[in-house]
Interface confidence: low
Amino acid sequence: PPRGRILGGREAEAHARPYMASVQLNGAHLCGGVLVAEQWVLSAAHCLEDAADGKVQVLLGAHSLSQPEPSKRLYDVLRAVPHPDSQPDTIDHDLLLLQLSEKATLGPAVRPLPWQRVDRDVAPGTLCDVAGWGIVNHAGRRPDSLQHVLLPVLDRATCNRRTHHDGAITERLMCAESNRRDSCKGDSGGPLVCGGVLEGVVTSGSRVCGNRKKPGIYTRVASYAAWIDSVLA
């Protein structure tokens, strides 16, 4: 099943997020991803946990998953590099870099997104954009076109309350509010974009979606700048 959803959002403007990627397993959407360099897509490590022998590919330049679009192109994956400390049973270090079989053909609908290198928390209340092709309601309806939602960043102390994530949110993670509007599981790997800069990647832990007491959890890319640079080098 696809790992992710955007709840309470709306259809995105077509091709307005040219960094957006669909990580696909055997031709079906599995996770979100974000183009961070011409030949590299950043996603979540847990996305490939169940991939085993399946064929992993990356779709770029898409708005609709099914309709023909001039900018759409499916790339094979040359190399998958999960963060070395990622583990199946934790949300920590949930990052994955996918090297495309060739450099992406850049254009208005396909372009890398600048990512945050300054390791400083995003101010609570900042509105950030998260997008994905995950299911859009609890009944499991899956959209064909890209959805997005604006979510306010939630401060770590609140997110770490016993009734929320109970201390699990380390300095390398951040939270966004989840009151009816939310990202979830299979939007995993997708981008959290604040002020036009990639700040977070949707984690792929199993979490109740759209419940204000269980805020969305995102891996802070700035905290992993050294690792990202070392892989992309």
Partner: antibody, heavy 114, light 108 residues
């Protein structure tokens, strides 16, 4: 029914300490933080801190660091707040609360007087 | 820390009158974590409205809450005698959680 039972009024001398219990019932004690709040006479409320009964994790309001110490006893489903080096400024009603402020104890009046 | 300013500090309302109490925050707070409490003399505060606009269990429908960002309000559509009490707004968007100084509402 969720209940938080606090002890009766305390009259203590300046410089002394007092330990206020908050006994929880009607829910799983480890499922929610216990918050402590101060209300001086005729005034508003001040958050002192909260404690996670599951692992003992505590958040304090900087203002009350060194003044209040929060602890829990899981075996009796009781949270405690100890106030030390008491002065007249500490005279107030102290409440415990849980369920993200949905439930409150009845309050304990602490009077500091020589 | 976020300072919550309530106004008026005191007000008197006649039965049937519409009442609006306001709560202004020194910086933006999340509507999900803006609460209101009712307190009567000698009693503990009671959760009255949570997440800006949701009425707590047992709260009459004449109460409502609204707002966003730095500006929030509690409204009573038609004042009744039992509504006479102090009302406190409260945020826990960021630590430390803070409370407003309260509005004392009296029956005229």
């Amino acid at each position: 029914e969720v209940l938080l039972q606090q002890s009766g009024p305390e009259l203590v001398k300046p410089g002394a300490s007092v330990k206020i219990p908050c006994k929880a019932s009607g829910y799983t004690f480890t499922d929610y933080n216990i918050d402590w709040v101060k209300q001086s006479h005729g005034k508003s409320l001040e958050w002192i801190g909260d404690i996670n009964p599951n692992n003992g994790g505590i958040n304090y309001n900087q203002k009350f660091k060194g003044k209040a110490t929060l602890t829990v006893d899981k075996s009796s489903s009781t949270a405690y707040m100890e106030l030390r080096s008491l002065t007249s400024e500490d005279t107030a009603v102290y409440y415990c609360g849980t369920g993200d402020y949905a439930y409150w104890g009845q309050g304990t009046l602490v009077t500091v007087s020589a | 820390q976020i300072v919550l300013t309530q106004s008026p500090a005191f007000m008197s309302a006649s039965p049937g009158e519409k009442v609006t109490l306001t709560c202004s925050a020194s910086s933006s707070v999340s509507s999900s974590y803006l609460y209101w409490y009712q307190q009567k003399p000698g009693s503990s505060p009671k959760l009255w409205i949570y997440s800006t606009s949701n009425l707590a269990s047992g709260v009459p429908g004449r109460f409502s809450g609204s707002g966003s960002g730095t500006s929030y309000s509690l409204t009573i559509s038609s004042m009744e005698a039992e509504d006479a009490a102090s009302y406190f707004c409260h945020q826990w968007t960021s630590y430390p959680p803070t409370f407003g100084a309260g509005t004392k509402l009296e029956l005229k």
